[in-house]
């Protein structure tokens, strides 16, 4: 969370940004809020990126002004125009690229004053794992699979019954490059599993951490998977 103050004469406004992460190939959001101003025509939003000449995006007088937009962002940006009056200056970024990572500035000018704040935007790939019982193996095993990660993550297994146990000797993890030659598919197999136990497969890089849980009993199979972005907010 970054809060910036701007001073214009006696006036300043608070601008707030949140460190966020973009999943390459998908759409992302660079979050920025400011003190609302009901006078839409008096609001100017400028997004800038460190090391890039020209603007990432500009919104003024109630509409986009892309005359100074840098070509790497052409056709890929939009603000939430209907939410500007309530103080939302967040930027939607289409088809996130690895090269979109960096430091961005959200600059705001309203009739109340002006202000800006920086945000760090990380890019990579992250996805939820699917965890399944693998009957193909010679002994009952669990297969944890996640389709898109970058940079290469670490993979670890844990179990509710054997807390603190090291499963590296009884698991096998592979990384397979996807067709676009950047992201990788992660597959990890845990061998010799027992029923009535909850197992967790944890996949983590510097951007995200994903966990898949599975509990197998004689009468039911319960699965969960979740993902959290790291260092955001």
């Amino acid at each position: 969370l970054i809060i910036g103050f701007g001073i214009s004469g006696k006036h300043f406004i608070t601008v707030t940004t949140f460190t966020s992460a973009g999943n390459i190939g998908e759409d992302g959001t660079l979050s920025c809020t400011f003190e609302p101003d009901i006078k839409l025509n008096g609001i100017v939003i400028q997004w800038l990126k460190e090391g890039i000449k020209g603007l990432v995006h500009e919104f003024k007088e109630g509409k986009d002004d892309l005359s100074q937009q840098h070509e790497m962002f052409r056709g890929r940006t939009a603000v939430f125009a209907d939410q500007v009056v309530v103080g939302n200056a967040s930027l939607r970024l289409k088809n996130v690229q690895l090269t979109d990572a960096g430091t961005y500035t959200c600059y705001i000018r309203t009739s109340k004053g002006k202000g800006n704040a920086n945000l760090e935007y990380k890019t990579g790939a992250f996805s939820m794992p699917e965890i399944n019982v693998d009957y193909n193996a010679s002994s009952e095993s669990l297969r944890c699979e996640a389709p898109r990660w970058f940079p290469q993550p670490t993979v670890a297994w844990a179990s509710q019954v054997d807390q603190g146990a090291n499963f590296s000797e009884v698991s096998n993890t592979s990384f397979e490059l996807n067709s676009e030659n950047v992201t990788m598919k992660v597959v990890s197999v845990l061998y010799n599993v027992t029923i009535n136990n909850t197992y967790s497969c944890m996949i983590e890089n510097d951007i995200a951490k994903a966990t898949g849980d599975i509990k197998v009993t004689d009468s039911e199979v319960k699965r969960r998977s979740q993902l959290q972005l790291l260092n955001s907010g």
Epitope: M128, E130, P147, R223, S225
Partner: antibody, heavy 130, light 107 residues
Amino acid sequence: QVQLQESGPGLVKPSQTLSLTCTVSDGSISSGGYYWSWIRQHPGKGLEWIGNIYYSGSTYYNPSLKSRVTISVDTSKNQFSLKLNSVTAADTAVYYCATEKALATVTPSGYENYYTVDVWGQGTTVTVSS
Amino acid sequence: DIQLTQSPSFLSASVGDRVTITCWASQGISSYLAWYQQKPGKAPKLLIYAASTLQSGVPSRFSGSGSGTEFTLTISSLQPEDFATYYCQHLNSYPLTFGGGTKVEIK
């Protein structure tokens, strides 16, 4: 969005094996994230989950049918199949193939997956009678 | 297996009415519940998942709420195309089970 079409005999004799195939179009059966499911509905009654299969071969069956059910996948034909053996009149039903997919929802700490049956075939009626 | 009980099993209502259907789970399932609509001779259609998340393309007059063991599906203003049978389904674990259904008919 994937589309599903069931096929197979509409009439099966008691004690024989019911065999149905589901053909997947507008999507690959071997892409991850989908569980290929079978669900049935007895005449005028509610829905019963039979089981599903993941492209890697992992299967999950309803314990009440497990001893009689086999679900398999043929990635080369983009199809998955249901076999239910030793059928009786109680197996007369409309059989649906469906996809179970993980749909993510936002949580305070990130995202969580909810596995939901979101695409269904049109259903095929199977009658068990001699 | 987790049992789901729906109430009422039959409901008679008029266009414009607010309709509420309840589903009880035999054990706590957090928010792992979905709602489906089925019309005669057709496959069920997903309306809501995660107890309250509206599936893409479903009209906003449909809403879901609840957590744990008690869940509700609400249709804020019943439309002619809403006369159908509604099922709840838990997403908590295998085997998946469905409620017995609620048939919504024209009064």
